[in-house]
Each structure stands twice: as C-alpha cells, then as structure tokens.
C-alpha cells in the first residue's frame, strides 16, 4: 500500500501535445487537450480535412486545428485562393512579340499580326486566305504571303500576263516585269536606249532603264 501512494496520476503528466493534466481521483486523471487534438492523452491530431474548403483544385493536407491545401500550378496560397501571375513568373510565356495577359487560373497571349496559338508560336498560314492566281505557288511569310508565278504570268498575285514573254527588249537587254501593272522594263546594254533599247546613244552614256 505504501508503494501505491507514490503513484500520482499527473506526475509526470501523461498528456501529450500540450494537453493539461487534471487529477480526478487517487488513480485517475483527465487531459484537457489543446484545440486540434483529442484522445484520452491528447494523442490524436483531429483530421480537419473532412470539412475542408481547398479551392481551385487544391488537395487537402491536415494540419493542427486547421488544414492546408496542395495547389495546382495556376493557384497559390494556403487554401489555393490566390491566382499565380504566370506573366511575372514566365516573362517569355508569349513568343514572337505576343503580350501576356494574366487571368484567374491561367493566362492568355495577345499575338501580334501573323502569329497565333496559345503562346503565339504558330505562324498563321496566310496562304490559306491568299488569292494567288491558280497555277501559281503561294509562299507563306509572317503576316503576309507572296505568289511565285508560272511562266507567262506576273504581278503580286500572278494575275497579269507577263509582258516580257514577247521579248520586247532588243540588243541583249534585260527584261523585267513591273509587279504592279505587268508592263515590261528594259535594262539596256551600254550604247543603247529607248523603251525597247533600239536607239543608239552617245559614247558617254551607259546603262539605261526604260519602262513600258
């Protein structure tokens, strides 16, 4: 019986996690637990996740008398309520001169003329809307296109007849076609002038350009 009297229920305290021990009888005790803990010795952390309010796809992680949330990349904060500004985090989120616009749960790119796609990395196929004359070949460029004309055709859209086909330039002159109006341009060799390079010139003059 003497050894029994040495037992003091609260010395040392059996209460853990900051619980306070109160002796309720000769051999009994009661633990008053701090918020977030339960059990006869406050040994259990109460699971706060069943009533969680993790937002925007966050996954609940139990804490002590609270909960935390594991957030998807577009959201941050203890409960995933804060939008991540992707435009600050990724200065090069938008390519080819596109402007980054932050949005709740993501971002968008405002692309400059000629580019498209989520990150402005896709060159818009201007040939899809081009009006190159049938038989010509369209070449896509950035925010523009050009038409490669078949023999006998000229102009920006290959819609004009090539005036050089009839060999209007004489005496070995070079013939070029004006892309705007389809007319020929003769670049005369030394000693010749005129629209068709058929006229002689003085010795002092060299290459002449004539349009027709």
């Amino acid at each position: 019986a003497g050894s029994d009297s040495l037992y003091v229920p609260c010395a040392p305290s059996p209460c853990v996690n900051g619980g306070t021990c109160r002796q309720t009888g000769d051999f009994t005790f009661e633990c008053n637990c701090l918020p977030g803990f339960e059990g006869s010795t406050c040994e259990r952390n109460i699971d706060d996740c069943p009533n969680h309010r993790c937002q925007n796809g966050g996954v609940c992680v139990d804490g002590v008398n609270t909960y935390n949330c594991r957030c998807p990349p577009q959201w941050t904060g203890q409960f995933c309520t804060e939008d991540v500004d992707e435009c600050l985090l990724q200065p090069n989120a938008c390519q080819n001169g596109g402007t980054c616009a932050n949005r709740n749960g993501g971002y968008g790119c405002v692309c400059v003329n000629g580019w498209s796609g989520d990150d402005c990395s896709e060159n818009i196929d201007d040939c899809a809307f081009a009006s190159c004359t049938p038989g010509s070949t369209c070449i896509d460029r950035v925010a523009s296109f050009s038409c490669m004309c078949p023999e006998g055709k000229a102009g920006l859209l290959c819609h004009l007849d090539d005036a050089c086909i009839s060999n209007p330039c004489h005496k070995g002159a070079l013939c070029d076609t004006n892309p705007l109006n389809g007319q020929y341009i003769c670049t005369c060799p030394q000693g010749y002038k005129g629209a068709d390079c058929t006229e002689d010139v003085d010795e002092g003059n060299s290459h002449h350009h004539h349009h027709h």
């Epitope: 969680h52 925007n56 796809g57 409960f79 309520t81």
Partner: antibody, heavy 120, light 107 residues
Framework: EVQLVESGGGLVQPGGSLKLSCAVS????????MEWVRQASGKGLEWVAA??????????VYSASVKDRFTISRDDSKSTAYLQMNSLKTEDTAVYYC???????????WGQGTLVTVSS | DIQMTQSPSSVSASVGDRVTITCQTS??????LAWYQQKPGKSPKLLIY???RLQDGVPSRFSGSGSGTDYTLTISSLQPEDFATYYC?????????FGGGTKVEIK
C-alpha cells in the same frame, strides 16, 4: 454569361419527397463547388449541402439538419446539380437557392430560388 | 461549427452616410469571409470575397477589411439603392455559416 436556374419546388406534405434541379450554363461545371442554401420566409440564409469539384472527386458535405434526409448529386453531362429531399419536415419550408462557389471564398453566382412548402 | 456574430441587426441611415457592419467568428477563418447584399424577393449578391476583395461590378463605395476572427463591411457613402439586408458568410470550412444579417433602413 454565368446562369443558374432552379426548378422542382412546390407544395408537399410532411414526410414527403421532392427533387430540386439546378441547370447551369456559362462555365465549366466540373471545375466548381456547387452549394445549396435555403432561406425561410423573413429569416436569414442557411447552408444546406455542397458538392465539391472534380479535382476533389465531387465529394459531398451536408448540414446536420438535413443529413440522412437530403442527397446532393450532379450530372456533368447535363451541367445540372440536384437536391433530393426526403422525409420532409415543416421546418424545411424555405426558398432553396443553388449557387456556384467562386473558388476565392465567396458564392459568386446564384439561381433565382425555388420555393418548397411543407404543409399538411 | 463556426459561429458568426453579425452586428448590428439593423441600422437606420441617410443617403450619404457612412455605414459599418461587423462580423465576428468563433475561430480564425484565415480571411475566408464573404459579404452579400440581398433585396426583398431577390437572390443574394456577392459584394466582397476573401474578406477584402471587391467582386467585379460592385461599386467602390463598398469595402471589406479584417483578419483572424474580426471582419468589417463599410459603405463609404450610402446610396438609395444600398438599402437592403447584408450578410457575412465564412467559407473556411464546412458547414458554411452565415451571420444573422443587418438590415440597412432609411432614416
């Protein structure tokens, strides 16, 4: 434009059942928590039930006053939330609202409400 | 459950007055608080979320503040269309709970 439209309210006897619907449009339904809130005439707002979003496996929570009597569900293919109400009591008489949880600590879109009257 | 104590339950005010409504929670809700306006026969309308953030389309005369357990809604200069009932609501954990409401009436 975000829209929520409730239907299914009406007069029912105590012990009876009723199923409310909330058809939504203008947003990706599966991304959002959906809440049901009710309001008795001349009284304040009382939360009833919630369905979390797809990221949280559409898990469900109920208020103590309706647990085991009410069932919340959702049909993603129809973008519709439901509240099946069984064993109705006179104290369940209220206007029932469905609302969208904004994901930023607030219910940012509400339906027009549907009146449920439980009376003999 | 988190208890919400909203005060006052009603307030009489004139156009142009500054009106303050408070909401106290029974535990820390980590700024997970929203404020709503409701007019008779209408659905509630979100004014403030996350304790202090103004919902899109809501006039800037409405503002929210607070943290921990104490929160405030302020209407800086009351307008005729502001006469309504205002509710606070905690969104930190389920069950969601609302304050009892504050009716703003014309003096």
């Amino acid at each position: 434009e975000v829209q929520l439209v409730e239907s299914g309210g009406g007069l029912v006897q105590p012990g009876g059942s009723l199923k409310l619907s909330c058809a939504v449009s203008g947003f990706t339904f599966s991304d959002f928590y959906m809440e049901w809130v009710r309001q008795a005439s001349g009284k304040g707002l009382e939360w009833v039930a919630a369905s979390r979003n797809k990221a949280n496996d559409f898990s469900i929570v109920y208020s103590a006053s309706v647990k085991d009597r009410f069932t919340i569900s959702r049909d993603d293919s129809k973008s519709t939330a439901y509240l099946q109400m069984n064993s109705l009591k006179t104290e369940d008489t209220a206007v029932y609202y469905c609302s969208r949880d904004s994901g930023r600590w607030g219910l940012d879109a509400w339906g027009q409400g549907t009146l449920v009257t439980v009376s003999s | 459950d988190i208890q919400m104590t909203q005060s006052p339950s009603s307030v009489s005010a004139s156009v142009g007055d500054r009106v303050t409504i408070t909401c106290q929670t029974s535990e820390d809700i980590y700024s997970g608080l929203a404020w709503y306006q409701q007019k008779p026969g209408k659905s509630p309308k979100l004014l403030i979320y996350g304790a202090s953030r103004l919902q899109d389309g809501v006039p800037s005369r409405f503002s929210g503040s607070g943290s921990g357990t104490d929160y405030t809604l302020t209407i800086s200069s009351l307008q005729p269309e502001d006469f309504a009932t205002y509710y606070c609501q905690q969104g930190f954990k389920y069950p969601l709970t609302f304050g009892g409401g504050t009716k703003v009436e014309i003096k």
